[in-house]
């Protein structure tokens, strides 16, 4: 009797998660990514904000920059020059789009402990970076690129045609930032800093999205962004390279575009330096099923870049678009001509291939009914990559090492058995020459970051183990999570189910489907999270399910490319199929089923609610796409083709939320959007609302004034509180 009484008292001290816990970030975790500066040294910002240099081999550490210096300019970020003579300090951070921001930069001279005076940097700067060797600086100011030989020198202006919203040099425009490069920069130093490559984006002919920003003034401001929607005029891109030692000699030299790409609309997709005098550019046709990788060499005699046809490698997809979400980038080997790259094998699984001369003669390095996800590093004798091979769980990530110095190459899983229950989803960060590396485990247990020897894989030390979080969770009744699969009509639907702490299979529970479902996404992952849905399960007794249906990633091309040219069909069908299977499990109250999603997930949740199945009582769409004609060209056309009569206009028209307005009559619908959403424009929700009003369908709506796609800050609290009330009302749960 006594043990059970003790057990009960322990149970009584346990508490459920509260919404406040989630909104306050009480159970957030930390990761540790070393800022590598050599094979055996890294920088890290300590808890008291000193910048500390750690030497793994000597075990010594010392402060290179004090928190006092950081605070003197209100620095929120820093960057050490490769020659270790200077540090840039970043302050006045001002966010623009997803990756882009402007900031003020100060240069601190470590040799004399003073800020560099004279020839100070202008403000605000759009992007700044050190050369890979020495302490040259490249920066972008007012859409033009400048070079500094040393921080105290006057700048050399490389471009002169930069113009707001018209010509972008060294930084991407909106669509390239969000949908192609996924960076705030579009300039790349050669390995030793001899050359600087950059992109110029000409947005002169792109239609502009305009929306009101209400602010606090008497009149709202109008925000104008050149934003190509599906089928519209796209940015015109050109790539230039300039010699940074003699920048005025011949000036920036344009890199030629492969003829087969230049014959119609095209994109530049990435640039990879191989050596100081060899560069690799990737190009993509506007119809994104053909990608060309072009290797170019510097011609000293002409001071130009030569891209011979023999060094063009074509990647083409016959079943969908090229690549996964993006076309993969090459990782070059030490011979500076052959490279490793991930692309689909003959069975339709993304795997690592070694290309020496032609893509046709590529040697497949990995194979199986799983996918290689990222190549981290290639050294003289090893290749490190991540995959979801282990135990056939697509939502896991383990790190592998292939020995490429020996034949046949041997493969070793570095992470599979380290902390098997706690850690099934890893990423890694390597020092120079992979002498050491950090592993960052994201779950399913509490995240942990560790340091390892690159030769032996031996764990050297724990960098971050989230002890405080572990202690804080000791008296919390967390929901149970399970990852399983459904086999339906030759399709495998992996799902994650989040169950209330005292889950009882004989009882009936309300079900909430959380959906994203976008092409090449993955929601069912073995990662740790204490978030809103954890609270809904822990405190409100809901069952939450996430399902990866057709169109999602890392399970082969058959699943991935199933949605090609017909977005909004199979993603929705598969959520509905899963719900029916969940009902069959016996513990779901089929009168209390809801669905919610954000962005692409808002689109899918809206279509699911309007599917006419009668399965869903209610649902929420946050910042949904409502018609693919309203979304960005680069993203939309990748999966849908063009909205023209001779291409795919019919499906563009058939796949809108508005076309299904009538079907919302029998569900409770909550539509939410930020009015300053630069990504999925408020227009999308405005059109849904208009269609519902025209159909005389009642619905609920919430807008967030001056908020973007992320609905951040105080809006986040309001949003989740509002959605919680809506769901509790829908599920008849007392407040």
């Amino acid at each position: 009797l006594r043990p059970s009484r003790v057990h009960n008292s322990e149970e009584n001290t346990m508490r459920a998660l509260t919404l406040k816990d989630i909104l306050n970030g009480t159970f957030s975790y930390k990761t540790f990514f070393p800022n590598w500066i050599s094979g055996q040294e890294y920088l890290h910002q300590s808890a008291d904000n000193n910048i500390v240099l750690y030497n793994i081999e000597t075990g010594q550490s010392y402060t290179i920059l004090s928190n006092r210096t950081m605070k003197s300019v209100n620095a929120s970020n820093y960057g050490l020059s490769p020659d270790r003579q200077f540090v840039y300090l970043e302050s006045d951070y001002s966010k623009l789009w997803r990756y882009s921001y402007t900031a003020t930069y100060y240069i601190y001279d470590l040799s004399n402990g003073e800020f560099v005076r004279g020839n100070e940097l202008p403000r605000p700067i759009q992007y700044l970076c050190w050369s890979p060797v020495g302490s040259k600086l490249a920066y972008v100011y007012q859409n033009n690129i400048y070079l500094k030989q040393r921080p105290g020198d006057p700048p050399f202006q490389i471009t002169f045609n930069g113009r707001e919203n018209k010509i972008f040099n060294g930084i991407p425009d909106w669509v390239y930032e969000e949908e192609m490069l996924a960076t705030k920069y579009a300039l790349w130093w050669s390995p030793n800093g001899k050359f600087l490559a950059y992109a110029e984006f000409n947005d002169t002919d792109i239609p502009v999205i305009a929306y009101s920003y209400y602010g606090d003034e008497q009149y709202p401001r109008t925000i104008n962004i050149p934003y190509p929607k599906a089928g519209a005029k796209n940015p015109v891109v050109r790539i230039f390279i300039i010699d940074t030692t003699y920048p005025a000699y011949v000036g920036p030299q344009e890199v030629p575009v492969p003829a087969m790409i230049a014959s119609s609309d095209y994109y530049f997709s990435w640039l990879t330096w191989v050596t100081d005098e060899r560069v690799c550019l990737q190009w993509l046709k506007r119809v994104q099923n053909v990608s060309v990788l072009s290797i170019c060499d510097f011609r000293e005699d002409w001071q130009t870049w030569d891209c011979p046809k023999t060094q063009e490698h074509i990647e083409e997809s016959r079943t969908g678009w090229a690549g996964g979400f993006f076309v993969s980038t090459p990782v070059f080997s030490y011979d500076a001509i052959s490279y490793y790259k991930i692309f689909s094998d003959k069975d339709g699984y993304k795997h690592i291939h070694y290309i020496k001369d032609t893509v046709e003669n590529a040697i497949q390095i990995t194979s199986g009914k799983w996918e290689a996800i990222n190549i981290f590093r290639v050294t003289q004798d090893s290749l490190f990559y991540s995959s979801n091979e282990f135990e056939e769980y697509p939502g896991r990530r383990n790190i592998y090492r292939i020995s490429i110095g020996s034949y046949p190459p041997s493969k070793k899983c570095v992470t599979c058995h380290l902390r098997k229950e706690r850690c099934q989803y890893y990423t890694a960060s390597f020092s120079d020459y992979a002498k050491y590396y950090a592993l960052v485990c994201y779950g399913p247990g509490i995240p942990i970051s560790t340091l390892h020897d690159g030769r032996t894989d031996q764990e050297i030390k724990i960098l971050e183990e989230n002890k405080e979080l572990e202690n804080a969770l000791k008296n919390i009744q967390l929901p149970k999570e399970e990852i399983k699969k459904l086999e339906v009509d030759e399709i495998t639907l992996w799902y994650k189910m989040i169950l209330p702490p005292q889950f009882d299979r004989s009882k009936k529970y309300p079900l909430l489907i959380q959906v994203y479902g976008g092409p090449c996404s993955q929601s069912v992952r073995s990662v740790f999270a204490v978030n809103w849905i954890s609270y809904l399960a822990s405190k409100e007794g809901m069952v939450i399910a996430l399902v990866d249906g057709r169109g999602t990633a890392f399970q082969g091309d058959k699943l991935l490319y199933a949605v090609y040219r017909k977005l909004g069909v199979y993603e929705v069908e598969d959520q509905i199929t899963a719900v029916r299977k969940f009902i069959e499990m016996g513990f779901i109250d089929e009168k209390r089923i809801a669905i919610w999603g954000w962005s692409y997930g808002g689109y899918v949740s809206s279509l699911a609610l309007a599917s006419g199945t009668g399965l869903f009582k209610c649902g929420i769409a946050v910042a949904p796409v409502s018609s693919w004609e309203y979304y960005a060209s680069v993203y939309t056309e990748r999966f849908m083709g063009l909205p023209t009569k001779d291409d795919n206009l019919e499906h563009y028209k058939n796949s809108t939320v508005m076309a299904r307005a009538e079907y919302f009559r029998n569900v409770d619908y909550l539509l939410i959007h930020g009015t300053a959403d630069d990504n999925v424009h408020f227009q999308n929700s405005a059109q849904i609302a208009k269609a519902l009003v025209n159909a005389q369908v009642d619905f609920q709506a919430m807008w967030y004034s001056d908020q973007n796609h992320g609905l951040s800050g105080l809006s986040t609290n309001h949003l989740y509180t509002h959605m919680t009330h809506f769901l509790k009302q829908c599920f008849s749960l007392s407040d």
Partner: antibody, heavy 118, light 107 residues
């Protein structure tokens, strides 16, 4: 503080040789293009030669090509100009200057006078 | 080679005057044009680089403008220490060339 100090000037006979030196301090010498500029008495400025940061790349004015050789020793932070087959028209004050970005001369030495006369 | 032609070759002006010196290149040099001041027995001193950028420490009464082939140096209000010879210089193609100079004398 950037300093450039020239030395090695003097009187030399036509056809003779002279080696000028320029000692640099106050900046990272090995990172910059360096140059020689001359000024004949009462005349304007004339660029003579430049040398790249690593020392492998050089440029010369047509008037001195084949006779003058520019070099540098980055370990000693020193720039040199070897002048052979000197002519009367080479008489000038020779300035050592830093040629920033290969475009403008941002720092100059005080100059050293070379007189070519019999 | 790119030839640089300065005008006038000399000028007389008084303290407080606005002085303009022009420089023309024989072909387009974009904005790779620099201005120097030289006083007797001294080394030249950089005033303006890249056509319009003021070198650190140079008084703001000096300004530069132009691009392509035609450039101007302006001294908004001539000071006693500004009496000197001024040279323009182009920095294209790693073959720097100077103008013949403009001597600014006291009226």
């Amino acid at each position: 503080e950037v300093q450039l100090v020239e030395s090695g000037g003097g009187l030399v006979q036509p056809g003779g040789s002279l080696r000028l030196s320029c000692a640099a301090s106050g900046f990272t010498f090995r990172g910059y293009i360096m140059s020689w500029v001359r000024q004949a008495p009462g005349k304007g400025l004339e660029w003579v030669s430049w040398i790249g940061p690593e020392g492998s790349r050089t440029g010369y004015a047509d008037s001195v090509k084949g006779r003058f050789t520019i070099s540098r020793d980055n370990s000693k932070n020193t720039l040199y100009l070897q002048m052979n087959s000197l002519r009367a028209e080479d008489t000038a004050v020779y300035y050592c200057a830093r040629l920033l970005y290969g475009t403008w001369f941002d720092y100059w030495g005080q100059g050293t006078l070379v007189t070519v006369s019999s | 080679d790119i030839q640089m032609t300065q005008s006038p070759s000399s000028l007389s002006a008084s303290v407080g005057d606005r002085v303009t010196i022009t420089c023309r290149a024989s072909q387009s040099i974009s904005s790779y044009l620099n201005w120097y001041q030289q006083k007797p027995g001294k080394a030249p001193k950089l005033l303006i680089y890249a056509a319009s950028s003021l070198q650190s420490g140079v008084p703001s009464r000096f300004s530069g403008s132009g691009s392509g082939t035609d450039f101007t140096l302006t001294i908004s209000s001539l000071q006693p220490e500004d009496f000197a010879t001024y040279y323009c210089q182009q920095g294209r193609l790693l073959l720097p060339t100077f103008g013949q100079g403009t001597k600014v004398e006291i009226k």
